[in-house]
Interface confidence: low
Amino acid sequence: MVRLPLQCVLWGCLLTAVHPEPPTACREKQYLINSQCCSLCQPGQKLVSDCTEFTETECLPCGESEFLDTWNRETHCHQHKYCDPNLGLRVQQKGTSETDTICTCEEGWHCTSEACESCVLHRSCSPGFGVKQIATGVSDTICEPCPVGFFSNVSSAFEKCHPWTSCETKDLVVQQAGTNKTDVVCGPQDRLRALVVIPIIFGILFAILLVLVFIKKVAKKPTNKAPHPKQEPQEINFPDDLPGSNTAAPVQETLHGCQPVTQEDGKESRISVQERQ
């Protein structure tokens, strides 16, 4: 009767010596199971059986199209993501036993979310707007309004605002101002136009001169009445408002009539009205 307690005490001492207090926490890359610490399976491998007093943790590599990306005690590997072409997706980076497949969108499309579950068409920038940042597989097109001096006349997901044509560098002048949707229209220089205008001016001046000479001749003709003996022929002083004596107005009118600049100004205002509609 007395032996039993003594045996129990002895066994208890023996067990305490062989099995110290069960751990409550394990080292990094270990896990606690059945009061003992077992090694986790490395990335790319799954758990087959936990460790025992006598055996190590048993792990197996993930199969084809499977992965595990952390130290783990998973009994099943995760399936690689499927890049569904029906959703506009394609493989950007093939998965390994340790990494998942990375999907991206087909050309001209971008992901709807960070997880890239499906795709949407890239936005196009309307006329008057240019592409500030071309879309990527994960972000949409960023548009910006064309500032003064720039234009865009197309709807595009790629084209930036173009600078207005510099008429000066082509030895031309601006005939029609540019807008955010249209380029400037260049025309010939005033110098070139002068080649046409100057002969016209000289022609008019020559005609006026002929008229003056003719009037002078007519004035010098002797009259039927007898002149007063002492009266000498008088030089005729023409008044300033006589037609032809002030050439500025007709020349200016002719120039104005020949100048497309004034006509184009009107044309431009009509175009901008249409654009606002």
Partner: nanobody
């Protein structure tokens, strides 16, 4: 199994409005483009409108632009088509379809709902 069930069709006078619904099941609705197509009596299928998975991008046929509005509620797995200013030429069976992209073709569609526009 993919299932698409349209409802909301009926007889309406020219200039009137209707709202079609399409209840989707059997697939992950929120990640798919959805489309409405229609078939007028004695004619072929005509594409009407498409919407992207998030509902942010919509496309319309010229014949319905400005009159029809496509929308979706991903929490209810439901697609909608609000039809305003209806015309006689809008008379057709309207089908809701799960779209394939990028080309917006469709691989599954419902049994359809008839919309008749007549005075």
């Amino acid at each position: 199994e993919v299932q698409l069930l349209e409802s909301g069709g009926g007889l309406v006078q020219p200039g009137g409005s209707l709202r079609l619904s399409c209840a989707a099941s059997g697939f992950t609705f929120r990640v798919y483009w959805m489309t409405w197509v229609r078939q007028a009596p004695g004619k072929g299928l005509e594409w009407v409108s498409s919407i992207d998975p998030q509902g942010g991008m919509t496309y319309y046929a010229d014949s319905v632009k400005g009159r029809f509005t496509i929308s979706r509620d991903n929490s209810k797995n439901t697609l909608y088509l609000q039809m305003n200013s209806l015309r006689a030429e809008d008379t057709a069976v309207y089908y809701c379809a799960k779209a394939r992209i990028p080309n917006l073709e469709f691989d599954y569609w419902g049994q359809g709902t008839l919309v008749t526009v007549s005075s």
